[in-house]
Interface confidence: low
């Protein structure tokens, strides 16, 4: 158990932060998005799901160092944390044919990364090792997106592993170990 930084496969490292995100004020409704009784969704309210522009999805700047084992990037990188509840800024009445209760089987929008950018970083290693060059993929923008089965399975449910994304011209990477395997590794770190 615990939060010790750990390496959970050959390529993904959970680093230590250099600075801290400061989430801006939430909506007037302070209910959290992740309360157990809501199954990870906002509280049940009738609303129209079509106008995504009304949704509240914020981009928080987040500065961190990239690490690879004992090596650390010479400079911190800045990326975005996507934060916020993808529900309308104002709730619409449940008029016949207009309103829809938010429910597990209904449309599900989440505030998730929309665009990424690649950045080359130089990793400095202890013991006189030569610096390593690495390319990292950083979140560049966030958006309220309607979930597809792909989002559900590979991006949202398993925070502990990398999403297996087939890349053009490459064989798909085998899927990383499950969150349970990562948790076990974490527990063994103590």
């Amino acid at each position: 158990q615990g939060w010790q930084a750990f390496k959970n496969d050959a390529t993904e490292i959970i680093p230590e932060l250099g600075e801290y995100p400061e989430p801006p004020p939430e909506l007037e409704n302070n209910k959290t998005m992740n309360r157990a009784e809501n199954g990870g969704r906002p509280p049940h309210h009738p609303f129209e799901t079509k106008d995504v522009s009304e949704y509240s999805c914020r981009e928080l700047h987040f500065t961190r160092y990239v690490t690879d084992g004992p090596c650390r990037s010479a400079k911190p990188v800045t990326e975005l944390v996507c934060s916020g509840q993808c529900g309308p800024a104002r709730l619409l009445p449940n008029a016949i044919g207009r309103g829809k209760w938010w429910r597990p089987s209904g449309p599900d929008f989440r505030c998730i990364p929309d665009r990424y950018r690649a950045q080359r970083v130089q990793l400095l290693c202890p013991g006189g090792e030569a610096p390593r060059a690495r390319k990292v993929r950083l979140v560049a923008s966030c958006k309220c997106k309607r979930l597809t089965r792909f989002h559900n399975q590979s991006e949202l449910k398993d925070f502990g592993t990398e999403a297996a994304r087939p890349q053009k011209g490459r064989k798909p990477r085998p899927r990383a170990r499950s969150a349970k395997a990562n948790q076990a590794e974490l527990e063994n770190a103590y």
Epitope: G2, A5, T11, R64, V66, T67, G84, P113, R134, T161
Partner: nanobody, 126 residues
Framework: EVQLVESGGGLVQAGGSLRLSCAAS????????MGWYRQAPGRQREMVAT????????NYTDSVKGRFSISRDNNKNTVYLQMNSLKPEDTAVYYC???????????????????WGQGTQVTVSS
């Protein structure tokens, strides 16, 4: 998903002390930083203190430096806010926050999220 449960709020006289706790459960191995934020009636939510879950790096807003102390217990997956020399202006609802960010080296990524607890009321009377 990550669940955050705060406790320790209450009514205290000016100059007194309180200790807030925030217990995290769920996908805690994805959390990189945790923090305490507060919101007084009619005001915006503001950062009070944050701490990284691995290295324990801390950050405080100017108005609480020297009075408040944030700490963590990695075995219990809990973050604490020790509040000393409380002032009436510290009265607010205090929220626990967990921020996560995916990936490091490599192309595969998972999305980043910020989670909030339900809040605990702290009232400082003069």
């Amino acid at each position: 998903e990550v669940q955050l449960v705060e406790s320790g709020g209450g009514l205290v006289q000016a100059g007194g002390s309180l200790r807030l706790s925030c217990a995290a459960s769920g996908s805690i191995f994805s959390i990189l930083t945790m923090g305490w934020y507060r919101q007084a009636p009619g005001r915006q939510r503001e950062m009070v203190a944050t701490i990284t879950t691995s290295g324990g790096l801390t950050n405080y807003t100017d108005s609480v430096k020297g009075r408040f102390s944030i700490s963590r217990d990695n075995n219990k997956n809990t973050v604490y806010l020790q509040m000393n020399s409380l002032k009436p202006e510290d009265t607010a609802v205090y929220y626990c926050n967990a921020a996560m960010v995916g990936g490091g080296v490599g192309l595969g990524r998972r999305p980043s999220f910020s989670y909030w607890g339900q809040g605990t009321q702290v009232t400082v009377s003069s």
